[in-house]
C-alpha cells in the first residue's frame, strides 16, 4: 500500500478580517493510525492551532467529523480572523506511539493572508494658527490595513494637492500596516470656509474610499484691516470718530481707543457681522469732546487680534478748525506693535 501523503491543496488563502478562514487538508490513507495537528509556522517555535486529540481551541472547528473511522478530511475553519492570524499553516499527521505520538508527515503548508480595512483617516493641522500666504502642514494617519498596497490623495476644496509626502509602515512584512502622510497647503484670505481632505483607497474598500477632513477655520488667522474715519458733528463740541475693523478671523479681538496716547476705552468685539468668505467686520466709535482739548488731538484705534501683537491706525483731530469742516482720516498711520504696552 502506498505511503500516506498529507495534501494541502491551497497554496494560499485570502480572507477578510472578521470572516472565517477554511484551511483544507486531506490524507491519502487511513494508515498509520494517529491524530492530526495543525500548526502555524515551522521549526521548534511553531504554534499549535488545533490538536485532534486534546486541547481547547475555541475559534477552530473541523469541516468533517474526525471521530468517524474512515475520515480522511482534516480541514479546519478558523473564525473571526484578524491580521494577527496571517502566516503559513501546516497540517501534520502523527503516528500513534507510546508514550508520545510521533510526527509522521506534514502537508506543504497554506499561507493565510488577511485583508483588513484601514481605519478612518485622521487629519490634524498645525498647533498654531497661520496667516494667508503662509504654508502650513497637515498630517493624515490611517492604521490596521492589510495588504500593504494603499493609495492616499489630498484635496483642498475638491482640488487635488500635489505637495505631500507619504510613508507606509513598516517597510517589511507585517500582519497590518499604517500610513502617514504630510501635505503642505498655502493659505489664502478666502480659506475660512475651506476644507482639506485626505482620501484613502484600499482593496478592502471596494472602490469607496475613506475620507478624513480638517477645516481651515481651525488653522487660519486673517488679520484685520483698520480704517479710522471722522463722522459729521453730532453737537457743536462733539466729534464722532469710528474705527472700522474689517475682514478678520477668528472673532477674538480687543480694541482700545487712545487719546494722545492715553487709554480712553477698551472693548471686546461682540456684535460682529459675518462676510460671505467667513471673515468678520466690526465697528467701534468714539465721541470726542473737542472743547475739552486745547491742542490738536491724536486719536488711535489699537486692535489686538487673536492674541497677536497690536496693530493700530491714528487720526489727527485739529481742534483749531471747525469740526464740521474737518476732513476724514487725515494723517492716518499704522504704528505696528510698538504701542501694545500703552494700556
Amino acid at each position: 500500500e502506498e505511503e500516506l501523503q498529507v495534501i494541502q491543496p491551497d497554496k494560499s488563502v485570502l480572507v477578510a478580517a472578521g470572516e472565517t478562514a477554511t484551511l483544507r487538508c486531506t490524507a491519502t490513507s487511513l494508515i498509520p493510525v494517529g491524530p492530526i495537528q495543525w500548526f502555524r509556522g515551522a521549526g521548534p517555535g511553531r504554534e499549535l492551532i488545533y490538536n485532534q486529540k486534546e486541547g481547547h481551541f475555541p475559534r477552530v472547528t473541523t469541516v468533517s467529523d474526525l471521530t468517524k473511522r474512515n475520515n480522511m478530511d482534516f480541514s479546519i475553519r478558523i473564525g473571526n480572523i484578524t491580521p494577527a492570524d496571517a502566516g503559513t499553516y501546516y497540517c501534520v499527521k502523527f503516528r500513534k506511539g507510546s508514550p508520545d505520538d510521533v510526527e509522521f508527515k506534514s502537508g506543504a503548508g497554506t499561507e493565510l493572508s488577511v485583508r483588513a480595512k484601514p481605519s478612518a483617516p485622521v487629519v490634524s493641522g498645525p498647533a498654531a494658527r497661520a496667516t494667508p500666504q503662509h504654508t502650513v502642514s497637515f498630517t493624515c494617519e490611517s492604521h490596521g490595513f492589510s495588504p500593504r498596497d494603499i493609495t492616499l490623495k489630498w484635496f483642498k476644496n475638491g482640488n487635488e494637492l500635489s505637495d505631500f509626502q507619504t510613508n507606509v509602515d513598516p517597510v517589511g512584512e507585517s500582519v497590518s500596516y499604517s500610513i502617514h502622510s504630510t501635505a503642505k497647503v498655502v493659505l489664502t484670505r478666502e480659506d475660512v470656509h475651506s476644507q482639506v481632505i485626505c482620501e484613502v483607497a484600499h482593496v478592502t474598500l471596494q472602490g469607496d474610499p475613506l475620507r478624513g477632513t480638517a477645516n481651515l477655520s481651525e488653522t487660519i488667522r486673517v488679520p484685520p484691516t483698520l480704517e479710522v474715519t471722522q463722522q459729521p458733528v453730532r453737537a457743536e463740541n462733539q466729534v464722532n470718530v469710528t474705527c472700522q475693523v474689517r475682514k478678520f478671523y477668528p472673532q477674538r479681538l480687543q480694541l482700545t481707543w487712545l487719546e494722545n496716547g492715553n487709554v480712553s476705552r477698551t472693548e471686546t468685539a461682540s456684535t460682529v457681522t459675518e462676510n460671505k468668505d467667513g471673515t468678520y467686520n466690526w465697528m467701534s466709535w468714539l465721541l470726542v469732546n473737542v472743547s475739552a482739548h486745547r491742542d490738536d488731538v491724536k486719536l488711535t484705534c489699537q486692535v489686538e487680534h487673536d492674541g497677536q501683537p497690536a496693530v493700530s491706525k491714528s487720526h489727527d483731530l485739529k481742534v483749531s478748525a471747525h469740526p464740521k469742516e474737518q476732513g476724514s482720516n487725515t494723517a492716518a498711520e499704522n504704528t505696528g506693535s510698538n504701542e501694545r504696552n500703552i494700556y
Epitope: 509556522g41 521549526g43 521548534p44 517555535g45 504554534e47 499549535l48 517589511g172
Partner: antibody, heavy 117, light 108 residues
Amino acid sequence: DVQLVESGGGLVRPGESLRLSCAASGFTFTNYAVTWVRQAPGEGLEWVSLISVTGTTYYADSVKGRFTISRDNSKSTLYLQMNSLRAEDTAVYYCAKVTWKNVFDYWGLGTLVTVSS
Amino acid sequence: EIVLTQSPGTLSVSPGERATFSCRASQTVGSKLAWYQQKPGQAPRLLIYDANTRATGIPARFSGSGSGTEFTLTISSLQSEDFAVYYCQQHTDWPPYTFGGGTKVEIK
C-alpha cells in the same frame, strides 16, 4: 497580560543540581514553544534550551547531557533541571515565550544561578 | 552554527541624534534576523523580527534593514529611554538559536 515568572535560582557548588521553574500566564501555554536563555554577569545572551508544543526538546552544546527541559501543560509551567553544574553555568536564567516566527516575544525577569565553591 | 558579529561594541550618541549599528552573520540567514533591547537589570525586549518588522508596541523610530549576512538597526532620534544594549539573533537555523555579542548605546 503575558507573564513569565522564574524561580529556583540560588547558590550551589560545582557538580550539584538545581531545578528552575517558570510559571506562565496570560496566554494558552499548550499552544506555544517555550525556551531558556541565560546571561552570565556582564556578558551577552546565550540560548540554552527549548521545548516545542509537541514536547520535542533542543539544547545548546554547552549544556547537552547535563540539563533537561520539560513542561507541565496542566500547570502552565516550564522547568529546567540542571545537573553537574559548573562555574561557567553562573548566570541569570530567563524563560521566554517563542513565537511561530522562532523569536522570543515575552521574557521573564530572570533568576540568578551562582555556581561557586 | 551561525555566528553573529555586532559592531561597534559601544556607540556614544547624544539624545535626539540618529544611531545606527550593524550585525553580520557568518552565513546567510535570509531575512530571519531579530533585534532585542536590554536595559540594565531588565529582561530583553523584542524590537524587530524578519529583519524589518517591528514587534507589537515598538515605536516607529526603531527600524531594521538588510538581508543575507548584513543587517542594520537604526534609531532615528534617540530618546533617553533608548540607551541600552542591543542584541541581534538569527531565527532561520535552529538549533542553536544564536545571538550577537551586543552593542551598548551610551549617552555622549
